[in-house]
């Protein structure tokens, strides 16, 4: 009863002569355990005998005997884990057919048939390709062999055009009840160059011997692969020549569908064949050409061909690095004349005259000068001829005003206070002079351009300079005006003594002045309107207080005379001419007030007084006035005073005070 038995195995096992087979097998029986297991080769059921007959390859008896001559068959299963796996090693062609697994339990019997296919020679593996191969898109190639056996080592190897492939493969084996196989999977990125190439999967034995193989031709879809050819095969052509470019499609899978041509990346109109012909080429057809060809995979662009159309130089023009150029600066001249090939020789012209020794595309004048100004033109020459000379370019050389001089328009000599007219002149200038500058700057009148009027000229206007200016100022050498003026800065200066003047000192005063033009001068000294001397110095051998006073000196030259400020001469001396005065007279009545005053002449003034009696006794009074109040008869006598300043002391002569009795006193007596 089939419902009681469940046996799993691959169904068909493939092998070849001399190899082995490994039959994975599991079983399950519903009623009881397996008691007997017999492996038949091509079993047939004998109806009469009600049993299977055939070659017995294996029989599980109590002692697990194998029929004689069948040691190559091994039953690898056991009853405990329901395993019925078996192997035949080696296997032979005549083992092909059915393997019958006769299984008997206590109550049930079953015959399971497994197909065994043993070929004479090792059968080839099968290469499986994905439905589409496209360049640079990785794919997995599979090589499948319906064989695997633990006792027989094999290896699958991949080859491309007979050479082992460099890509790594993943080899896997299956020995399960579902399937028995050996598989090699190789992943790689097909390139367009692989299209049409043969990929082989080889089956090798343990010794590396090739047992069988399978081959497939790769169909790698790819964009067109292009090369471009030029006829004639030179990409440098002359103006007027004809050129043909051919776009060669070296490979395209699938076939190409569209063709277009591009020049400098821009499609050319109505050019959609593999051949591009350019008739009577012009300069404008110089450029980079390529063809673009598309198929279902996508577009492809060829390498670029640089077509150069040669022509004689075109009319030239001159480019000047700077115009106007500043005198002394560097100026570069460039001859621009489109030509192919580039000009090899240049001729330069200045104002129509050939410039000698200049044959390059550009030349340089390191320090430009005014005479370099003018029109520059050039001619360019290449192998196809000499180009036309263009109209030329103007060089303007600018420079500051040259040879600037200054002229005094006045008759000389010039005196302080005069009006002076100066003019500023120059020889040449580019651009024209547009203003003038003057030094020193003053509130001076400029009646016309380049003329300066100085009214009421100062004594100190010694030198004046002018500049003529355009974009730059050029200064003339300063002109000395030589202004004549009366002596200036006249003053009295004490030479000696260095300190304050004391009576009796030797004193010298100097009459100083700061400047005079002309230099020749005379001196005059004056005190209180009186002329004292005509030397630059005024000397006192022994100064007296009477010499004190206000002094002035005068200095004169041919232009005029100048007086100093009044200078006060001060003489210091000790108190002198002391005398005692009594405002109430020499005679005073007792009881009244007697006032004695000490009068003196001193410089500086007396700061301390002392009083003495007829006995030269110092009195306790220190002021200028001595007050006796009330006066007594005993006060009668002679008195004198002493005055002190920081220079010294002086004293007065004696003066006699007489004090008489009052009538009251006399009456009492």
């Amino acid at each position: 009863d089939s419902s009681k038995w469940n046996i799993e195995h691959p169904g068909t096992i493939y092998a070849w002569e001399g190899a082995c087979v490994w039959v994975p097998c599991t079983y399950r029986v519903l009623d009881g355990a397996l008691e007997t297991f017999i492996l038949f080769h091509n079993p047939e059921y004998n109806q009469n005998m009600s049993k299977f007959e055939g070659t017995r390859l294996y029989e599980s008896t109590k002692d697990g005997k194998v029929p004689s001559g069948q040691k190559r068959v091994q039953f690898l299963g056991n009853k405990i884990n329901n395993n019925c796996t078996l192997s035949i090693h080696p296997v032979h062609v005549n083992d092909s057919g059915q393997l019958g697994l006769r299984m008997v339990s206590k109550t049930e019997k079953w015959m399971e048939r497994i197909h065994l296919n043993v070929s004479e020679r090792p059968f080839p593996p099968r290469i499986q390709l994905p439905p589409k191969l496209q360049e640079s898109q990785e794919v997995t190639l599979t090589c499948l062999l319906n064989f695997s056996c633990y006792g027989y080592q094999i290896q699958l190897q991949w080859l491309l055009e007979g050479v082992p492939m460099r890509q790594a493969a993943v080899t896997s084996t299956s020995l399960s009840t579902k399937s028995v196989f050996t598989r090699s999977e190789l992943k790689f990125s097909p390139q367009w160059s692989h299209h049409g190439k043969i990929v082989t999967c080889e089956l090798h034995d343990v010794d590396g011997k090739v047992l069988s193989e399978d081959m497939v031709q790769l169909n790698v879809k790819h964009t067109p692969k292009l090369t471009i050819e030029v006829t004639p095969n030179e990409t440098i052509v002359r103006k007027g020549d004809s050129v043909t470019m051919t776009c060669k499609v070296n490979s395209s899978n699938p076939e190409y569908t569209t063709v277009s041509w591009l020049k400098d990346g821009i499609p050319l109109k109505e050019q959609n064949t593999l051949m591009l012909t350019l008739h009577e080429v012009t300069k404008s057809q110089t450029g980079r050409y390529c063809c673009r060809v598309s198929n279902d995979v996508g577009p492809a662009t060829s390498e670029k061909v640089f077509l150069q159309v040669q022509y004689a130089p075109e009319p030239s023009r001159v480019q000047i690095s700077q115009s106007p150029a500043v005198e002394g600066s560097e100026v570069n001249f460039l001859c621009i004349s489109p030509a192919n090939p580039l000009p090899t020789n240049y001729t330069w012209y200045h104002n129509g005259k050939e410039v000698q020794g200049r044959t390059e595309k550009q030349f340089q004048i390191q320090k430009i000068l005014p005479w370099h100004a003018g029109t520059y033109s050039c001619e360019a020459e290449n192998i196809l001829g000499i180009g036309e000379r263009g109209p030329g370019t103007e060089l303007d050389v600018q420079y500051p005003p040259k040879k600037v001089t200054m002229v005094i328009e006045n008759p000389t000599p010039i005196r302080e206070g005069d009006t002076v007219t100066l003019s500023c002149n120059y020889s040449s200038s580019n651009p024209i002079v547009n203003h003038y500058e003057w030094r020193p700057r003053g509130a001076w009148e400029e009646p016309s351009l380049g003329v300066l009027k100085i009214q009421n000229i100062g004594w100190n206007n010694t030198a004046v300079a002018c500049a003529a200016c355009n974009n730059w100022c050029s200064w003339a050498s300063p002109v000395t005006l030589n202004v004549l003026y009366a002596p200036r800065g006249v003053r009295v200066r004490k030479i000696k003594p260095l300190s304050e003047i004391h009576s009796g000192n030797s004193v010298s005063l100097q009459c100083d002045f700061s400047s005079s033009h002309p230099k020749e001068v005379q001196f005059f000294w004056e005190k209180n309107g009186s002329l004292l001397g005509k030397e630059s110095q005024l000397n006192f051998d022994s100064i007296s207080p009477e010499d004190a006073g206000s002094y002035s000196c005068w200095v004169n030259n041919s232009i005029g005379q100048t007086a100093s400020k009044a200078w006060t001469l001060e003489v210091l001396y000790a108190p002198r001419r002391l005398r005692v005065s009594m405002s109430q007279g020499n005679q005073v009545m007792e009881g009244k007030t007697a006032t004695l005053t000490c009068e003196s002449d001193a410089n500086p003034p007396v700061y301390s007084y002392a009083w003495f009696d007829w006995n030269n006794q110092s009195l306790p009074y220190s002021g200028r006035m001595l007050r006796l109040e009330p006066v007594k008869v005993q006060h009668s006598g002679a008195y004198w005073c002493q005055g002190t300043n920081r220079v010294g002391k002086g004293h007065s002569p004696l003066i006699t005070l007489t004090v008489y009795y009052s009538p009251q006193t006399i009456g009492r007596r």
Partner: antibody, heavy 119, light 106 residues
Framework: QVQLKESGPGLVAPSQSLSITCTVS????????VHWVRQPPGKGLEWLGM???????DYNSALKSRLSISKDNSKSQVFLKMNSLQTDDTAMYYC?????????????WGQGTLVTVSA | QIVLTQSPAILSTSPGEKVTMTCSAS?????MYWYQQKPGSSPRLLIY???NLASGVPVRFSGSGSGTSYSLTISRMEAEDAATYYC?????????FGAGTKLELK
């Protein structure tokens, strides 16, 4: 010229995951395969896995459960992610590119990034 | 996976001497690749596709072999060649490297 440069965290705690970026220049990731190889200190080289131009991956079966390789073609970056790190994952991690699109030996290597697995 | 065994592990040699190191694969490989690595630097591709010299590699380096047996040879050792050399297979995933041969100067 072809250049590869790895950048990684340096230190990873045990049981944590590792992320390394390989930034490439001089070639297109859409055409070439990029592989990851590691080298423990003082030891030999071990192939970890690869990513193909089209984005499919192959891994070393011993590490397959913990590995993930991905990429961003526009940024020219390939990423390696490895989970459940242990101390024996301490190694110098390299990204490399073969001589050809998909084979021919590792002609180009990054300078490597050292990953230390430690608490 | 394919296991690559490099020998010797350490190799000491003098300048000017010829050096040969080997790499044995656990199963057949199509091509072998060789790298040089100096301390603190990334590996550098020396040999690709078994015998081709990578760009900028001196001609004193050469590679050979097939199947499971490959070798790297330095015709005349120079001081700058002191480094660790790794072989690598690109036949079967996962890609694998040898454990390395450390080349030292005597």
């Amino acid at each position: 010229q072809v250049q590869l440069k790895e950048s990684g965290p340096g230190l990873v705690a045990p049981s944590q995951s590792l992320s390394i970026t390989c930034t490439v220049s001089g070639f297109s990731l859409s055409r070439y395969t990029v592989h990851w190889v590691r080298q423990p200190p003082g030891k030999g080289l071990e192939w970890l896995g690869m990513i193909w131009g089209g984005g499919s991956t192959d891994y070393n079966s011993a590490l397959k459960s913990r590995l993930s390789i991905s990429k961003d073609n526009s940024k020219s970056q390939v990423f390696l992610k490895m989970n459940s790190l242990q101390t024996d994952d301490t190694a110098m991690y390299y990204c490399a590119r073969p001589h050809d699109f998909d084979a021919g030996g590792f002609a180009y290597w990054g300078q490597g990034t050292l990953v230390t697995v430690s608490a | 996976q394919i296991v690559l065994t490099q020998s010797p592990a350490i190799l000491s040699t003098s300048p000017g001497e010829k050096v040969t190191m080997t790499c044995s694969a656990s199963s057949r490989v199509n091509y072998m690749y060789w790298y040089q690595q100096k301390p603190g630097s990334s590996p550098r591709l020396l040999i690709y596709d078994t015998s081709n010299l990578a760009s900028g590699v001196p001609v004193r380096f050469s590679g050979s072999g097939s199947g499971t047996s490959y070798s790297l040879t330095i015709s005349r050792m120079e001081a700058e060649d002191a480094a660790t050399y790794y072989c690598q297979q690109w036949t079967s995933y996962p890609l694998t490297f040898g454990a390395g041969t450390k080349l030292e100067l005597k």
